[in-house]
């Protein structure tokens, strides 16, 4: 389980009218459910139940976003429509270039994501918890356009991007 270095870039307009980027760094873990790869895309917050919908149209998302899912306490959803791994798969099927799970409320999800899968996803599935998760969700809950960059090594420079 390697460390995932996540940079969250917020686009803010400055008084001069230009756009400034603010970068926040946090760490998570690459789970065995996905690949240990770099990925980047606009952050799209997804409700766990939102991943239950299986309409054809819902699979026609544009490619290249990073899904952020805050998992709820298991007792709030005793009969989930999909396993955590199933939810990650559904997000990737819809065009997510990576999925980040906040497992703070549901630490059991870590074991589910790390069960050796014969067919792991070809995109990264990262989990965050504790202070890093709080930091991430604080940014995600702002009404701002934000991009996440996930890397499997510490970022060399704060503005580094990589190919999708």
């Amino acid at each position: 389980k390697e460390t995932a270095f996540v940079e969250v870039v917020l686009f803010e307009s400055s008084p001069s009218g230009d756009y400034t980027t603010y970068t926040t760094g946090l760490t998570g873990r690459f789970s065995r459910a996905g690949a240990t790869l770099s990925a980047e895309g606009e952050i799209v917050q997804m409700h766990p139940l939102g991943l239950c919908n299986n309409n054809d149209e819902e699979d026609l998302y544009e490619y290249g976003w990073v899904g952020v899912v805050k998992l709820e306490q298991p007792e709030l959803d005793p009969k989930p429509c999909l396993t955590v791994l199933g939810k990650a798969k559904r997000a990737v099927q819809r065009g997510a270039t990576a999925v980040i799970f906040d497992v703070s409320e549901n630490p059991e999800a870590i074991d589910q994501l790390n069960q050796g899968s014969e067919d792991p996803l070809k995109r990264p599935v990262v989990y965050v918890k504790g202070a890093d998760a709080i930091k991430l969700m604080n940014i995600v809950n702002k009404q701002k356009v934000a991009r996440a960059r996930i890397q499997h090594r510490p970022p060399r420079q704060p503005t580094e991007y990589f190919d999708m």
Partner: antibody, heavy 116, light 107 residues
């Protein structure tokens, strides 16, 4: 079937305001980012504004401070408020779905003509 | 803001010919560039995203490549239905910017 239908265009005098709407159907509107793109008659495409699914916004330099993009998820509708209009804002205005970029789904466009 | 220079602005080509359109950016945008096709009187459609990925249902004669800050759209063998305007869009840095377009016409 994904559908985007723009409305609200028309003839308006310089300095006046107009509000464009884009009605969405066939997908979960609240989950998606949305763009406005415009095209002056016989000219190229000009990216105008974007709103994320959590209502974060970004604008092109040409419209920042004059135009406002917004959305009403309960009505599956995207808006573009055009203030202090100039003759150079004359164009067909398209709405398009997409996160990082305008994707496969665009509306047919609504024509805004700014003239005295 | 990132400048996108598209060339040529117009292009005359024969059916079956190989066609290449180029976009050059003022700074590195990695592969954050799309190509759109717009036929006369129609709405633009997404052709290629992230520089090289062909949009579903688009013919395989279209392809995208890039090297550094230079991006190319290639049509391997021109068909009558390919007569259109072509635009590139950088979406690496906000605000996003389109190239000025290329008008592709039959010789």
């Amino acid at each position: 079937e994904v559908q985007l239908v723009e409305s609200g265009g028309g003839l308006v005098q310089p300095g006046k305001s107009l509000k464009l709407s884009c009605s969405a159907s066939g997908f979960t509107f609240s989950s998606h980012g949305m763009h406005w793109i415009r095209q002056a008659p016989g000219k190229g495409l000009d990216w105008v504004a974007y709103i994320s699914n959590n209502s974060g916004t970004i604008y092109s330099a040409a419209v920042r401070g004059r135009f406002t993009i917004s959305r009403d998820n309960s009505k599956n509708t995207l808006f573009l408020q055009l203030n202090s209009l100039k003759s150079e804002d004359t164009a067909i205005y398209y709405c398009a779905r997409g996160y990082n970029y305008p994707g496969a789904y665009w509306g047919q466009g609504t024509l805004v003509t700014v003239s005295s | 803001d990132i400048q996108v220079t598209q060339s040529p602005s117009s292009l005359l080509a024969s059916l079956g010919e190989r066609v290449t359109i180029t976009c050059q950016t003022s700074q590195s945008i990695r592969n954050y560039l799309n190509w759109y096709q717009q036929k006369p009187g129609q709405v633009p459609i997404l052709l290629i995203y992230y520089a090289t990925s062909l949009q579903t249902d688009m013919p395989s004669r279209f392809s995208g490549q890039y090297s550094g800050r230079s991006f190319t759209l290639t049509i391997t063998s021109l068909e009558p239905e390919d007569i259109a305007n072509y635009f590139c869009l950088q979406h690496y840095s906000v605000p996003y910017t389109f190239g000025a377009g290329t008008k592709l016409e039959l010789k």
